[in-house]
């Protein structure tokens, strides 16, 4: 009696158990009785990733450098392609469809990992002994400068934006 | 339901071209399947001559020695068969057939 | 070519017997993906051959279940599990796996 369930690649139609096409290759007509699938490969700028019975293959994925995207890896008949963004900038999703400009951490802020072609900066607010007085995408939080190993004197306290003012010793007695 | 039927002539003078067509009805020569023509000698058993893909593209039997020519006629869901320099061999009852569904076949005798 | 030879050429049994025909191909029938196409026919007396089984052991539709295929590889067989007076004709089997498609030289089946 005809099949009511097919095996792992293959799928049901007109009561016949079809083998799916292969990963790359799109499905030009389907099984019969007497004939099997028959499958025809995706040309340059398609592709198909998985074991399918779709009559078209998709489109290879544009990298628009307008923008601001560039190839990361160039499609096959099996893999789409894959963008990344140009230097400075990152994506705004994890399917990178367009790009955005990488974000500085401010004043009091340090770079915790510097940005990449699919990440933001991140940022860390600069802990107890450092700081960061500029607007950067790439500077960590720096240590406060150690007026003792100068044989010098705090003269005013750092900040998360400020280092210290070290100042001479008091030579009093 | 599909049906399909043969027509053409039933005597044919030997070293003419023998022409049937297969006519189709209740479902597209475009759609899928391979249609085919198939003989039986007088008291003999089936021979396949060759098909015509729902993609117009062909197969034929080597035996027939480039003798055999299978068109369609997309228009009126037909499909024909020419058979070259006929002989007295080529007496037969030939059948068209999508395989599953078969005509009921025509008779051609090659005699002068 | 794959040669299709038949076994017995004839057979004759009593109605309610079961009957087995066999059929072996020169080469294997089994393609790259794992598939055989071998079908098996009836011809009545006077009529056009009719699907039986497809793809070994698949029963066509309005087959009645007393027909049954089997095999792989190079060897099939057609059973039928008990004969009735409408089963009489020729038996015939069908390798679509190659091409040049080719039939077995045919089963005679008669009631005794």
């Known amino acids: 009696e005809p099949p009511t369930a097919c095996r792992e690649k293959q799928y049901l139609i007109n009561s016949q158990c079809c083998s799916l096409c292969q990963p790359g290759q799109k499905l030009v007509s389907d099984c019969t009785e007497f004939t099997e699938t028959e499958c025809l490969p995706c040309s340059e700028s398609e592709f198909l990733d998985t074991w399918n019975r779709e009559t078209r293959c998709h489109q290879h994925k544009y990298c628009d450098p307008n923008l601001g995207l560039q190839v990361q890896q160039k499609g096959t008949s099996e893999t789409d392609t894959i963008c990344t963004c140009e230097e400075g900038l990152h994506c705004t999703s994890e399917s990178c469809e367009s790009c955005v400009p990488h974000r500085s951490c401010l004043p009091g802020f340090g770079v915790k990992q510097i940005a990449t072609g699919v990440s933001d900066t991140i940022c860390e607010p600069c802990p107890v002994g450092f700081f960061s007085n500029v607007s950067s995408a790439f500077e960590k939080c720096r240590p406060w400068t150690s007026c003792e190993t100068k044989d010098l004197v705090v003269q005013q306290a750092g900040t998360n934006k400020t280092d210290v003012v070290c100042g001479p010793q008091d030579r009093q007695r | 339901e599909v049906q399909l039927q043969e027509s053409g002539p039933g005597l044919v003078k030997p070293s003419e071209t023998l022409s049937l067509t297969c006519t189709v009805s209740?479902?597209?020569?475009?759609?899928?399947?391979?249609w085919n023509w198939i003989r039986q000698p007088p008291g003999k058993g089936l021979e396949w001559m060759g098909y015509?893909?729902?993609?117009?593209?062909?197969n034929y039997n080597p035996s027939l020695k480039n003798r055999v020519t299978i068109s369609r006629d997309t228009s009126k869901n037909q499909f024909s068969l020419k058979l070259s320099s006929v002989t007295a061999a080529d007496t037969a009852v030939y059948y068209c057939?999508?395989?599953?569904?078969w005509g009921q076949g025509t008779t051609v005798t090659v005699s002068s | 070519d794959a040669v299709m030879t038949q076994t017995p050429l004839s057979l004759s049994v009593t109605p309610g017997q079961p009957a087995s025909i066999s059929c072996r191909s020169s080469q294997s029938l089994e393609n790259t993906n794992g598939n055989t196409f071998l079908n098996w026919y009836l011809q009545k007396p006077g009529q056009s051959p009719q699907l039986l089984i497809y793809r070994v052991s698949n029963r066509f539709s309005g087959v009645p279940d007393r027909f049954s295929g089997s095999g792989s590889g190079t060897d099939f067989t057609l059973k039928i599990s008990r004969v009735e007076a409408e089963d009489v004709g020729v038996y015939y089997c069908?390798?679509?796996?190659?091409?040049?498609?080719?039939f077995g030289q045919g089963t005679k089946l008669e009631i005794k």
């Open positions: 015509i893909r729902y993609d117009g593209s062909n």
């Open positions: 069908l390798q679509v796996t190659h091409v040049p498609f080719t």
């Open positions: 057939a999508r395989l599953d569904y």
């Open positions: 209740g479902y597209s020569i475009t759609s899928n399947y391979y």
